[in-house]
């Protein structure tokens, strides 16, 4: 997260760290007791590694009573996700067992009504991704409030040049932005999961390259079918 602040500890009990061989790889969001939603591209280079999900964490390194690392029983990328596009960049991870719920571990309601979030709406994005252009990684969860950007502006030639489909949404990125390591994390508007940080190699913090988020409402049928 660029230009954000340290989050209040455990105030986002849905927040997950998707880990590869014990190190933070991507963000994720607990959407059901045994399921974490993240981004498909996160697992592209994880073929031989051990993927796990950390729940109940604020600090990645410090011991915390609520922290627990779960093995992954099944990883389900969206069937249409492809390495070279940002489209359909969703991944569902089934935990080896149901998460132990509590004040610091709780699923987040996700948007099912397929309607765009109004431009200007302030949404919260959180993650353990890099906090500056030098690539510094934080130990504790960071967050930032970002206004939603209308699709027409986001699709300008100077911005994302038509790449933002109806299944994607944008948020402003002027010095405050999600970045490398935040992919798969939640964009939360009004207490509801609206988007998932896409995992392309987009420049961060540049006003002309808004943050791109996969709209979960557009994938409600797929999410329901996997969770069923």
């Amino acid at each position: 997260i660029l230009g954000g602040r340290e989050a209040e500890a455990h105030a986002r009990p849905y927040m997950a760290s998707v880990q590869l061989n014990g190190a933070h790889l991507c963000g994720g969001v607990l959407v059901a007791e045994q399921w974490v939603l993240s981004a498909a591209h996160c697992l592209e280079d994880a073929a031989d590694g051990k993927v796990q999900v950390l729940l109940g964490a604020h600090s990645l390194s410090q011991p915390e009573p609520s922290k627990r690392l779960y093995d992954v029983l099944r990883a389900v990328p969206h069937p249409d996700s492809q390495p070279d596009t940002i489209d359909h960049d969703l991944l569902l991870l089934q935990l080896s067992e149901k998460a132990t719920l509590g004040p610091a571990v709780r699923p987040l309601p996700w948007q099912r009504v397929d309607r765009d979030v109004a431009p200007g709406t302030l949404c919260d994005v959180a993650g353990w991704g890099i906090v500056n252009h030098a690539g510094r990684r934080p130990d504790s969860l960071q967050h930032v409030l970002l206004p939603v950007l209308d699709r027409a502006t986001c699709n300008r030639a100077t911005h994302h040049d038509g790449a933002i489909t109806e299944r994607l949404m944008c948020a402003e990125s002027n010095r405050r932005d999600s970045c490398k390591g935040d992919s798969g994390g939640p964009l939360v508007c009004g207490g509801v999961l609206e988007g998932v940080v896409t995992s392309g190699s987009r420049v961060c913090g540049n006003a002309k390259k808004p943050g791109i988020y996969t709209r979960v409402a557009s994938y409600a049928a797929w999410i329901d079918s996997v969770l069923a």
């Epitope: 230009g3 602040r5 200007g120 709406t121 302030l122 409030l145 010095r175 009004g190």
Partner: antibody
Framework: QVQLQQPGAELVRPGTSVKLSCKAS????????MHWVKQRPGQGLEWIGV????????KYNQKFKDKATLTVETSSSTAYMQLSSLTSEDSAVYYC???????????WGQGTSVTVSS | DIQMTQTTSSLSASLGDRVTISCRAS??????LNWYQQKPDGTVKLLIY???RLHSRVPSRFSGSGSGTDYSLTISNLDQEDIATYFC?????????FGGGTKLEIK
């Protein structure tokens, strides 16, 4: 405790500009955002914009984009708002208000009354 | 921009009364609603943030409730020092916007 000090009044000529100050004390200046709010006589409140003193990041209400410029001077823990091309419509009380990372304005200055008159 | 409407511009009540001030948003603001008190001398204070959370050092006789587009501020036991104008403000969408205010007077 948190205090935001603003001058009581400014009398300015039409067409000129004025720079209003808001001196903060009782907290770490860079840890709170600073909002500016306008109130015309007998009217409601209008949000002008906000600045993050830690890096001077600003967000403006489009209505005031060409009217107001927000700056900070961290060495003196002071926030400023410059109002340009003043007209009678700009005669109002202007408040600074601290915090509000989440949009709440937790601590308010006393307000500066700006009168635009020839 | 989101319009915030306080339909009652002035309200008269007796000391000790329970007073409710309402505020309506032109669209769902997901509980991102704050209440402010402005005294006759112009002093402004935050009373309640995020619909129902009491700001520090605000008396417990103040409470807030609501959801979606409709919100209210309640003063349970009206005190002389509560004579003021009360404004609601939405923090869901930029630009932040305020209601027109409700002026509370003593009968």
């Amino acid at each position: 405790q948190v205090q935001l000090q603003q001058p009581g009044a400014e009398l300015v000529r039409p067409g000129t500009s004025v720079k209003l100050s808001c001196k903060a004390s009782g907290y770490t200046f860079t840890s709170y955002w600073m909002h500016w709010v306008k109130q015309r006589p007998g009217q409601g409140l209008e949000w002008i914009g906000v600045i993050d003193p830690s890096d001077s990041y600003t967000k403006y209400n489009q209505k005031f984009k060409d009217k107001a410029t927000l700056t900070v001077e961290t060495s003196s823990s002071t926030a400023y708002m410059q109002l340009s091309s003043l007209t009678s419509e700009d005669s109002a009380v202007y408040y600074c208000a601290g915090n509000g990372y989440d949009g709440s304005m937790d601590y308010w200055g006393q307000g500066t009354s700006v009168t635009v008159s020839s | 921009d989101i319009q915030m409407t306080q339909t009652t511009s002035s309200l008269s009540a007796s000391l000790g009364d329970r007073v409710t001030i309402s505020c309506r948003a032109s669209q769902d603001i997901s509980n991102s609603l704050n209440w402010y008190q402005q005294k006759p001398d112009g002093t402004v204070k935050l009373l309640i943030y995020y619909t129902s959370r009491l700001h520090s050092r605000v008396p417990s006789r103040f409470s807030g409730s609501g959801s979606g587009t409709d919100y209210s501020l309640t003063i349970s036991n009206l005190d002389q020092e509560d004579i003021a104008t009360y404004f609601c403000q939405q923090a869901n969408t930029l630009p932040y916007t305020f209601g027109g205010g409700t002026k509370l007077e003593i009968k």
